[in-house]
């Protein structure tokens, strides 16, 4: 059997000492004679010890004994004991009591023989058994003074050999995870929850994680059981990015030919119906009105121009009603209305002129007279020696109710090559040149254009009292939207409850599925923030699509191009949502087209403005944007630019 070097040395040393034992005893007798009974010199002491180390150790101490107890001749017993103990360096014992097995006296020295687990010259140093091969322990080795023991990590127990460890199966205890799923792991276990939930060790249950506290969303975050959704400021032109957390700009995906003509004047800019141009003509010389211009529109009704004095004096208004020219005139307080000529709201350019002759007014379309009206008086009215005429374009300088026959003054039309009173007009041209909002789209088609920066709203009623039902009110919302979108996100149609600041109903384009967190181009039908139905749509193909929505008591359908959408709610949820909608419809609601007012982004799945062409039919009635309670001035009510032709 092989022993470690240290143990071998300790084992050999005592044997070596025993060989000298006879000499030690002889030396003790010799010391008695020479130095205890007699007084000895250093040389005599050297003869006793026969070596210098022990002599050098002994002699100074021998002299100390003499100083302390007197010379040998005084026969003081203390002296004899003092001298006899000097050669034994184990008295008093210099070795550590705890760690020493025995002390051996050496020549002027001593040797401490250590117990197992101890080391050092005095056997006072603990030997760290764990420093070599972890003391033979599989996991944890604990060093102790003079000893060591093995232990295991949490979740393991020590085997009977005192060295190896085995895993404890905590899941064997059914209470380990409470409501959560338990999974045993080497030395441990894990309580598992579904995604979006986290284990609560105190409650021993799965609790919803509020991801919103982790700042995952760039803008607005809404937590939900096991999940969360991010929302972006749609009204600010933002939508969710691919990662469903950050926001990005809503960019046009279909290029529309929105180029404008600097030599054109757009008449539909002022939704208020106020004129787009006001001109004051003043002459010393009596003058007659001559106005000529090229005109283009799809709008059936609106005011082209007004010429004359104040509302109670003499004036004419050239307007459009049912697509034909109408002339309203008031001369010295007497009003008349005349309508004649072809339908001119076909969207093509034509030349229109108004000429005041000596006793009549002549209206021409493409140089052909369509109206000739006898008048008694002049449009230029004398005042303080000067003749005055006010001319306004695209509106009248007073309220439309003060016309001979009320008309909706708003006219989505375009003028070019205008000539007022045979004079060149630099003022309007200069103004139009620097103001793009006063210019028309170079090319237009039928429809209404929503530029992605505003909405229109109406005050419509969705409750009805059928004759066969007596007084019981029922409700219905049926929307048909013909759309040619330019961007993939935006509100097509919505209802807003101003009192509650809620969005009872919305139909919108969206480019992701919020619950599946999946990017996909969809039309969403929602009541408040809950999607009732979704339907895929090829939104960026530049084609016209028909979105049909029908909601009534007990049913809600969404169709895109004749294909029915997928329901997102259970039958019970649908009934609950429709009840919410009906409650809203019993209170005042506003009907929005192309966007929403400033509502929280969480009010509806989409809050962004729609960009593209759209015509809306609500409950089988075509919505005319000129009839809206409000329309953003950049929305063109009766014209839409075409899709830009693809580059060759």
């Amino acid at each position: 059997a092989l022993l470690p070097a240290r143990e071998a040395t300790q084992f050999l040393r005592p044997r070596q000492r025993r060989a000298f034992q006879v000499f030690e005893e002889a030396k003790q007798g010799h010391l008695e004679r020479e130095c205890v009974e007699e007084l000895c010199s250093r040389e005599e002491a050297r003869e006793v010890f026969e070596n210098d180390p022990e002599t050098d150790y002994f002699y100074p101490r021998y002299l100390d004994c003499i100083n302390k107890y007197g010379s040998p001749y005084t026969k003081n017993s203390g002296f004899a004991t003092c001298v006899q103990n000097l050669p034994d360096q184990c008295t008093p014992n210099p070795c550590d009591r705890k760690g020493t097995q025995a002390c051996q006296d050496l020549m002027g020295n001593f040797f401490c023989l250590c117990k197992a687990g101890w080391g050092g010259r005095l056997c006072d140093k603990d030997v760290n058994e764990c420093s070599q091969e972890n003391g033979g322990c599989l996991q944890i080795c604990h060093n102790k003074p003079g000893s060591f023991h093995c232990s295991c990590h949490s979740g393991f127990e020590l085997s009977s050999d005192g060295r190896t460890c085995q895993d404890i199966d905590e899941c064997a205890d059914s209470e380990a995870c409470g409501e959560a799923r338990c999974k045993n792991l080497p030395g441990s276990y894990s309580c598992l929850c579904d995604e979006g939930f986290a284990y609560s060790s105190q409650e021993k249950a799965c609790r919803d994680v509020d991801e919103c506290l982790q700042g995952r969303c760039e803008q607005v975050c809404v937590n939900s059981p096991g999940s969360y959704t991010c929302h972006c400021d749609g009204r600010g032109g933002l939508k969710l990015s691919q990662d469903m957390d950050t926001c990005e700009d809503i960019l046009p995906c279909v290029p529309f030919s929105v180029a404008k003509s600097v030599k054109s004047l757009y008449l539909g800019r002022m939704f208020s119906g106020t004129p787009v141009i006001r001109l004051r003509f003043k002459r010393l010389q009596p003058t007659r009105l001559v106005a000529e211009f090229d005109f283009r529109t799809f709008d059936p009704e609106g005011i082209l121009l007004f010429a004359g004095g104040h509302q109670d004096s003499t004036w004419i208004v050239l307007a459009l009603r049912a697509g034909r020219l109408e002339l309203q005139l008031r001369y010295n307080g007497v009003g008349r209305v005349t309508s004649s000529g072809p339908v001119i709201n076909h969207g093509m350019w034509q030349t229109i002129s108004v000429e005041e002759l000596a006793r009549n007014l002549v209206i021409k379309v493409n140089r052909d007279a369509v109206m000739k009206i006898a008048v008694a008086g002049d449009l230029f009215q004398p005042e303080r020696g000067l003749y005055h005429l006010n001319l306004t374009v695209g509106g009248i300088p007073f309220h439309e109710k003060d016309l001979v026959q009320p008309i909706n003054p708003r006219l989505d039309g375009c003028m070019r090559s205008w000539n007022w009173l045979n004079g060149e007009d630099t003022t309007i041209q200069e103004t139009v040149k620097v103001n793009t909002r006063m210019q028309c789209f170079s090319v237009t088609e039928r429809g209404s254009f929503y530029p992605g920066s505003g909405f229109a709203f109406y005050s419509l009623d969705y409750m009805r009292t059928p004759l066969d039902v007596g007084t019981e009110s029922t409700w219905e919302v049926e929307v048909v939207a013909h759309i040619r979108p330019a961007a993939d996100t935006g509100v097509l149609f919505a209802l807003w409850a101003p009192d509650l600041r809620a969005v009872p109903l919305s139909v919108a384009l969206v480019d992701y599925h919020s619950t599946k967190k999946l990017k996909k181009q969809l039309v969403v039908l929602a009541v408040e923030h809950t999607a009732l139905a979704l339907m895929e749509i090829k939104v960026c193909d530049g084609q016209e699509h028909v979105v049909t929505v029908s909601l009534r008591d007990g049913e809600a359908t969404l169709e895109v191009d004749g294909t029915r959408g997928q329901s997102e709610v259970s039958a019970a949820q649908l009934q609950e949502r429709l009840a919410v909608l009906e409650r809203h419809l019993r209170s005042p609601v506003l009907t929005f087209a192309g966007g929403l007012p400033d509502v929280p982004v969480t009010s509806a799945p989409v809050t962004a403005f729609y960009r593209g062409c759209m015509t809306l039919e609500v409950n089988r009635r075509l919505l005319d944007l000129d009839e809206a309670a409000y329309k953003h001035s950049d929305i063109t009510a009766h014209s839409c630019p075409p899709v830009e032709p693809a580059a060759a």
């Epitope: 004051r280 003043k282 002459r283 010393l284 010389q285 303080r384 020696g385 000067l386």
Partner: antibody, heavy 116, light 107 residues
């Protein structure tokens, strides 16, 4: 473009007569009346009156009634200012200006100097 | 006859300074006031017409305000090229009347 071109400067003796012309181009002459404005050296502007280019009827301000006459040659699209019995105080630059209730288009001016 | 009183008769400013000229009328003329600039040897140039309307091509440093009988013409950040005589003209009633003029010089 619209232009009003006046005749050149004249040096006259007191008691003489002068006739200044103002030729219009770039617009229908009869659609706008023609005004005349006087500016004495180092002094301000004074409206003298106007002439109806349709009827030829002149209108003078009080100060310029009597020795002053506005006339037309419609075929030549020209207006005239004649000053009879010139006086030293008639020394001035005379401008024609198209009637628009105010004056946008002006002739370059004709300096008449009356000196013995 | 509506008389027009223009002030000051002359003023001297450094370039970049603001100029204010005032015209007061003897009768209420609504906003039928016009403002002209005349440089030596040239006819007057219409800067602002009735209704405080800046004429096409006239720099935006020129502006006017007023209604009734009190009217103000302003040049913001005067330039050396603005040295000229300035006149107001009322076109509310016949006879048309000019202000006496303001001579603008540079310091």
């Amino acid at each position: 473009q619209i232009q009003l071109v006046q005749s050149g400067p004249e040096l006259k003796k007191p008691g003489e007569t002068v006739k200044i012309s103002c030729r219009a181009s770039g617009y229908t002459f009869t659609n706008y009346g023609m005004n005349w404005v006087k500016q004495a050296p180092g002094k301000g502007l004074k409206w003298m009156g106007w002439i109806n280019t349709n009827t030829g009827e002149p209108t003078y301000t009080e100060e310029f009634k009597g020795r002053f006459a506005f006339s037309l040659e419609t075929s030549a699209t020209t207006a005239y200012l004649q000053i009879n019995d010139l006086k030293n105080e008639d020394t001035a630059t005379y401008f024609c200006a198209r009637d628009e209730g105010w004056f946008v288009y002006w002739g370059q001016g004709t300096l008449i100097t009356v000196s013995a | 006859e509506t008389t027009v009183t223009q002030s000051p008769a002359s003023l001297s400013v450094a370039t970049g300074e603001k100029v204010t000229i005032r015209c007061i009328t003897s009768t209420d003329i609504d906003d039928d006031m016009n403002w002209y600039q005349q440089k030596p040897g040239e006819p007057p140039k219409l800067l602002i017409s009735e209704g405080n309307t800046l004429r096409p091509g006239v720099p935006s440093r020129f502006s006017s305000s007023g209604y009734g009988t009190d009217f103000v013409f302003t040049i913001e950040n005067t330039l050396s090229e603005d040295v000229a005589d300035y006149y107001c003209l009322q076109t509310d009633s016949v006879p048309l009347t000019f202000g006496a003029g303001t001579k603008l010089e540079l310091k």
